[in-house]
C-alpha cells in the first residue's frame, strides 16, 4: 500500500491525531489535502517544523498561503522562524524574526498564546 492509499484509509481518524502521528505521517509521502490539515488539532500542528509540514502536505503545501489567516495555519506560522517559512516560496509572513531566540516557556505561552521571544 503506498502513502496515498494509506492516507485515504486513515483520513477520517486524523482529526484527533497527536503530533507524533503527524510527524510519522510526514515521512510516508501521504500528500495530505488542505481541508484535512485545517481540521487537525491546533496543539498537534504547532510543534511541526516547516520541513515536516512540507513533507506532510506535499503539493498541497501551496494552499497554505490562502489559509495563512486561519487556524491552525495562523498559529503555526507564529511558531516558525521566518527564514524557514521563506523556503516554502509562498510569501508567508508572521514568523519569528531572524536572530531572535525562542524560549519554550510553556506557562507564558499558555497564557499569551504566543511563544516568548528574546530580541538580538
Amino acid at each position: 500500500m503506498n502513502g496515498s492509499e494509506y492516507f485515504v484509509k486513515i483520513q477520517s481518524f486524523l482529526g484527533g491525531a497527536p503530533t507524533e502521528d503527524l510527524k510519522a505521517l510526514s515521512q510516508q509521502n501521504v500528500s495530505m489535502d488542505l481541508a484535512t490539515f485545517m481540521k487537525l488539532r491546533t496543539d498537534a500542528v504547532l510543534p511541526l517544523t516547516v520541513a515536516e509540514v512540507q513533507k506532510l502536505l506535499g503539493p498541497h503545501v501551496e494552499g497554505l498561503k490562502a489559509e495563512e489567516r486561519h487556524r491552525p495555519v495562523r498559529d503555526w506560522i507564529l511558531r516558525q522562524r521566518q527564514d524557514d517559512l521563506d523556503t516554502l516560496g509562498l510569501g508567508l509572513q508572521g514568523g519569528i524574526p531572524n536572530g531572535y531566540l525562542v524560549l519554550d516557556l510553556s506557562m507564558q505561552e499558555a497564557l499569551s498564546g504566543t511563544p516568548c521571544l528574546l530580541g538580538p
Epitope: D33, L34, Q54, P59, H60, E62, G63, K65, A66, D86, T87, L88, G89, L90, G91
Partner: antibody
Framework: EVQLVQSGAEVKKPGASVKVSCKAS????????MHWVRQAPGQGLEWMGN????????YYNERFRSRVTMTVDKSTSTAYMELSSLRSEDTAVYYC??????????????WGQGTTVTVSS | DIQMTQSPSSLSASVGDRVTITCKAS??????IAWYQQKPGKAPKLLIH???ELQPGVPSRFSGSGSGTDFTFTISSLQPEDIATYYC?????????FGGGTKVEIK
C-alpha cells in the same frame, strides 16, 4: 508591473531535449510558485507541473514525470522547463504562469507570452 | 485527478445573443473555478475567478455561477470582440486541470 517573458521558438528533432525559460519581473520571485502549461496545436490547455522558486522543489503532472525537469535561478528570477525524449506529439506552445493565492490553491493571473516548440525530423 | 468536462466544444451565435458554457467537475470543487478567454496566438486571459468574481477591467456582460460540481459561464450579449476559445480551470486541487475549451464563433 508583473511580467513573464519567455524564450524564443525552438525546432527540435525527435529524441532531443528542449529547455524553455521564463524570466519574471515586477514581483518578488520567491513568493509565488511558477507553473507550466502547454497547448498542442488546435488543442486545449494542459497543466504540466510547478516549482517552488525558493527551494527549487518541483511537483509534476504524472503524465510528464519521467521526461520533465523544472528548475529556477533565483539570481536572475528565471524559471526553466526542460522536456526530454521529444516526440512529434510534444509540438506545442509552452506557457509559464503565476498563480494568485486568493483562495484554495490559486488560479493563474499572469501568463508568459508562450514559447512554440516544434518537434520534426 | 479532477476531470473538468466542458460543453459545448464549439458554438455559433449572433451578435447580441446570450451564450452559455458549462463545466462539470468529476468531484466537488466548492467554488474554486476560473474562466479564461484565449484568442489565436495569445496567452489565456483571466476573466473570472472563484466562480463569479469578475477580474478588474472585464466587461460586466461576462458572468459565472455554480458550486460543487456544476458551473456555468455566460456572455449576456455576445459582441464581435468576444470571438475566442473559453476554458474553465479548477484550482481546488494543487494538480490543476482545465476543461477542453469552447470555441465561440459569430453566425
Amino acid at each position: 508591473e508583473v511580467q513573464l517573458v519567455q524564450s524564443g521558438a525552438e525546432v527540435k528533432k525527435p529524441g532531443a531535449s528542449v529547455k524553455v525559460s521564463c524570466k519574471a519581473s515586477g514581483y518578488t520571485f520567491t513568493n509565488y510558485w511558477m507553473h507550466w502549461v502547454r497547448q498542442a496545436p488546435g488543442q486545449g490547455l494542459e497543466w504540466m507541473g510547478n516549482i517552488n522558486p525558493s527551494n527549487g522543489g518541483p511537483y509534476y503532472n504524472e503524465r510528464f514525470r519521467s521526461r520533465v525537469t523544472m528548475t529556477v535561478d533565483k539570481s536572475t528570477s528565471t524559471a526553466y522547463m526542460e522536456l526530454s525524449s521529444l516526440r512529434s506529439e510534444d509540438t506545442a506552445v509552452y506557457y509559464c504562469a503565476r498563480p494568485y493565492y486568493g483562495s484554495s490553491y490559486g488560479y493563474f493571473d499572469y501568463w508568459g507570452q508562450g514559447t512554440t516548440v516544434t518537434v520534426s525530423s | 485527478d479532477i476531470q473538468m468536462t466542458q460543453s459545448p466544444s464549439s458554438l455559433s451565435a449572433s451578435v447580441g445573443d446570450r451564450v452559455t458554457i458549462t463545466c462539470k467537475a468529476s468531484q466537488d470543487i466548492n467554488k474554486y473555478i476560473a474562466w479564461y478567454q484565449q484568442k489565436p496566438g495569445k496567452a489565456p486571459k483571466l476573466l473570472i475567478h472563484y466562480t463569479s468574481e469578475l477580474q478588474p477591467g472585464v466587461p460586466s456582460r461576462f458572468s459565472g455561477s455554480g458550486s460543487g460540481t456544476d458551473f456555468t459561464f455566460t456572455i449576456s450579449s455576445l459582441q464581435p470582440e468576444d470571438i475566442a476559445t473559453y476554458y474553465c480551470l479548477q484550482y481546488a486541487n494543487p494538480l490543476r486541470t482545465f476543461g477542453g475549451g469552447t470555441k465561440v464563433e459569430i453566425k
